[in-house]
């Protein structure tokens, strides 16, 4: 019921329903780093390093902290108010269309292309055509693969970021 009643007491929070006029919409909600007790009486602190909550909330449980996968490094640990921040290890990157895993960055560009962007944790190396300067988006074998790989071996597509 607390979500439907005008939440009057305290300061603004990020998940208030936009239709309702709320002078102080965190009433009936617990602050970041807490969750509501099952009986609705109190706010209970999340457990540092185990779970977290980022917004004013009426969650019965805090959210479980992410554990970085192998192939990832932990940039910042999980706190009661912020999830773990994981990043791909050097030489690997995470694509928007496959965020579940880090992929190896290509070691070079296809023939006739030059590298204009390095491998970063969020993007593969960036290649452009020597003459036109346009980015390449096709799945083209990298320099080494042109020489060594057998036909049909999949290669990472060039990055479109920039």
């Amino acid at each position: 019921e607390s979500a439907l009643i005008t939440q009057q007491d305290l300061a603004p929070q990020q998940r208030a329903a936009p239709q309702q006029k709320r002078s102080s919409p965190s009433e009936g909600l617990c602050p970041p780093g807490h969750h509501i007790s099952e009986d609705g009486r109190d706010c209970i602190s999340c457990k540092y390093g185990q779970d977290y909550s980022t917004h004013w909330n009426d969650l019965l449980f805090c959210l479980r902290c992410t554990r970085c996968d192998s192939g990832e490094v932990e940039l910042s640990p999980c706190t009661t108010t912020r999830n773990t921040v994981c990043q791909c290890e050097e030489g690997t990157f995470r694509e928007e269309d496959s965020p579940e895993m880090c992929r190896k960055c290509r070691t070079g560009c296809p023939r006739g292309m030059v590298k204009v962007g390095d491998c970063t944790p969020w993007s593969d190396i960036e290649c452009v055509h020597k003459e036109s300067g346009t980015k390449h988006s096709g799945e083209v074998p990298a320099v080494e693969e042109t020489v060594t790989s057998s036909p049909g071996t999949p290669a990472s597509p060039c990055s479109l970021s920039g």
């Epitope: 007491d9 305290l10 009433e27 602050p31 009486r41 706010c43 602190s45």
Partner: antibody, heavy 118, light 107 residues
Framework: QVTLKESGPGILQPSQTLSLTCSFS??????????VSWIRQPSGKGLEWLAH???????RYNPSLKSRLTISKDTSRNQVFLKITSVDTADTATYYC??????????WGQGTLVTVSA | DIVMTQSHKFMSTSVGDRVSITCKAS??????VAWYQQKPGQSPKLLIY???TRHTGVPDRFTGSGSGTDFTLTISNVQSEDLADYFC?????????FGGGTKLEIK
């Protein structure tokens, strides 16, 4: 708009029972998580929390006064009551009711002065 | 019971100054601490809750900080209307307890 207003006898004698009423508007004590507390303040001194009643009639008391305190409510009439038995001069104070829900006392009444005098 | 100690009963400051009022809890209360302002003849008014969240309508010159056992209410650019008593309170566990109060005097 949330408002609370306390009322009491003003003056009473030692050993009598003090009865206080908190009348409120702008919220319902049937709303989940809602609660009202009684807090007192002797003149020129600090604040002392006395008792709290929740929407579901669960009650909490200050252990130092528990044997003398009774908190109750009438949800339909938007009122909360406090009784203090066997009063003495040390109970002379301004008595406040205040609302809380999952946190601090965000709304307070104006207070009612109670004097215990022989 | 958790004892909330405000070590300064009185603090003197001038208009435009910055003043910090401290409060110490006898045991860890997380961030379940509120600060109230009480002007002469009035009931207390909530300024800060959950240690650092400013209540609706409270000027941004009032800021709260701290967690665990040590808490601070800072008033920057003190105004004459800030003459009042300031109380901290813990709502981490029953019985709820208040600090003894700090009276802010304006020179």
């Amino acid at each position: 708009q949330v408002t609370l207003k306390e009322s009491g006898p003003g003056i009473l004698q030692p050993s009598q029972t003090l009865s206080l009423t908190c009348s409120f508007s702008g919220f319902s004590l049937s709303t989940s998580g809602m609660g009202v507390s009684w807090i007192r303040q002797p003149s020129g001194k600090g604040l002392e929390w006395l008792a709290h009643i929740y929407w579901d009639d669960d009650k909490r008391y200050n252990p130092s006064l528990k044997s003398r305190l009774t908190i109750s409510k009438d949800t339909s009439r938007n009122q909360v009551f406090l009784k203090i038995t066997s009063v003495d001069t040390a109970d002379t104070a301004t008595y406040y009711c205040a609302r809380r829900r999952l946190g601090p006392f965000a709304y307070w009444g104006q207070g009612t002065l109670v004097t215990v005098s022989a | 019971d958790i004892v909330m100690t405000q070590s300064h009963k009185f603090m003197s400051t001038s208009v435009g100054d910055r003043v910090s009022i401290t409060c110490k809890a006898s045991q860890d209360v997380g961030t379940a601490v509120a600060w109230y302002q009480q002007k002469p003849g009035q009931s207390p008014k909530l300024l800060i809750y959950w240690a650092s969240t400013r209540h609706t309508g409270v000027p941004d010159r009032f800021t709260g900080s701290g967690s665990g056992t040590d808490f601070t209410l800072t008033i920057s650019n003190v105004q004459s209307e800030d003459l009042a008593d300031y109380f901290c309170q813990q709502y981490s566990s029953y019985p709820y307890t208040f600090g003894g109060g700090t009276k802010l005097e304006i020179k």
